[in-house]
């Protein structure tokens, strides 16, 4: 497997306490947002998930910086890639979504980052 | 000052029903997720169930999935979970607890005793 | 259902320091386990410690930090006083539920 380690801000929320409560609903459907953004991204072949999904408050705290990691079969895709196919898809983000997605930053994970199972 | 008063505990059967209660006080309850964890007697600390702010999302241990349910009313900052099915091994002091931060504030538990 | 491990007992020192661990079954311990501790004392209602790694709860002493610590989460306490001597839990989030530890039983020698 590869791995990919993603980062990126959306603009147009507001980060709160609620987001560093995995229990709660802001967390449970931002998390559900993104998940199936990523699988629309990505549906093409050799995506296998994403994991260790974590939130934080943007500049200012007043965006929400997202950090994960994306798992995809080995040798299907590279960085460039990843982030190519990401940034392409920040219009439909928007539109689908309601995200505003800025700064996105994709960098390789080096085998194995942990053993913690792909969600 | 934070309050979390639980109720309803006592000596049921196997395969009996309670239900416990959670009163908050202190706080603004409608904006913490909520939980309840347990204690056996002489035990660590087990989990048991947790529920949103608003009770859209509900989660359960796999030891208490399909007999437990986490309710919540707002209205009333009240928290409850209703046991169903009940065995033995749920024998403990039951807590609520809010979340955040560590679980930070807890009740002074309600025991909960199945033997026939 | 993942298991979550900690020390049983540990000793420390008034003064001293000590670092308390939890692991995870499923691997390493990361930020999106929202590592939590909570402290236990006779006599005394549960106290939340630590929440989402490392956020002190409020009134929490400046003595108690949560980090992560060669693949686990950690509760290191300096400045050991005799009123820390305490049982201490550590609980893990995945995915959809939290998981408790055993707990560790922490001895400050008198």
């Known amino acids: 497997m590869s791995f990919f380690f993603l980062s990126f801000h959306i603009s147009n929320l507001q980060f709160n306490s609620s987001l560093e409560d995995p229990s709660t609903d802001y967390y449970q459907e931002l998390q559900r947002d993104i998940s199936e953004m990523f699988l629309q991204i990505y549906k093409q072949g050799g995506f296998l998930g994403l994991s260790n999904i974590k939130f934080r408050p943007g500049g200012g705290g007043g965006s929400v910086v997202v950090q994960l990691t994306l798992a995809f079969r080995e040798g299907t895709i590279n960085v460039h890639d990843v982030e190519t196919q990401f940034n392409q898809y920040k219009t439909e983000a928007a539109s689908r979504y309601n995200l505003t997605i800025s700064d996105v930053s994709v960098s390789d994970v080096p085998f194995p980052f942990s053993a913690q199972s792909v969600d | 000052e934070v309050q979390l008063l639980e109720s309803g505990g006592g000596l049921v059967q196997p395969g009996g029903s309670l239900r416990l209660s959670c009163a908050a006080s202190g706080f603004t309850f409608r904006v913490y997720a909520m939980s309840w964890v347990r204690q056996a007697p002489g035990k660590g600390l087990e989990w048991v169930s947790g529920i949103s702010e608003t009770g859209s999302y509900t989660y359960y241990a796999d030891s208490v999935k399909g007999r437990f349910t986490i309710s919540r009313d707002n209205s009333k900052n009240t928290l409850y979970l209703q046991m169903n099915s009940l065995r033995a091994e749920d024998t403990a002091v039951y807590y609520c607890?809010?979340?955040?931060?560590?679980?930070?504030?807890w009740g002074q538990g309600t025991l909960v005793t199945v033997s026939s | 259902q993942a298991v979550v491990t900690q020390e049983p007992s540990l000793t420390v020192s008034p003064g001293g320091t000590v670092t308390l661990t939890c692991g995870s079954s499923?691997?390493?311990?990361?930020?999106?386990?929202?590592a939590n501790w909570v402290q236990e004392k006779p006599g005394q209602a549960f106290r939340g410690l630590i929440g989402g790694t490392n956020k002190r709860a409020p009134g929490t002493p400046a003595r108690f930090s949560g980090s992560l610590l060669g693949g686990k989460a950690a509760l290191t306490l300096s400045g050991a006083q005799p009123e820390d001597e305490a049982e201490y839990y550590c609980?893990?989030?995945?995915?959809?539920?939290?998981?408790f530890g055993g707990g560790t039983k922490l001895t400050v020698l008198r």
């Open positions: 607890a809010r979340y955040p931060y560590g679980f930070d504030y």
């Open positions: 499923t691997g390493a311990v990361t930020t999106s386990n929202y």
């Open positions: 609980a893990l989030w995945y995915s959809n539920l939290w998981v």
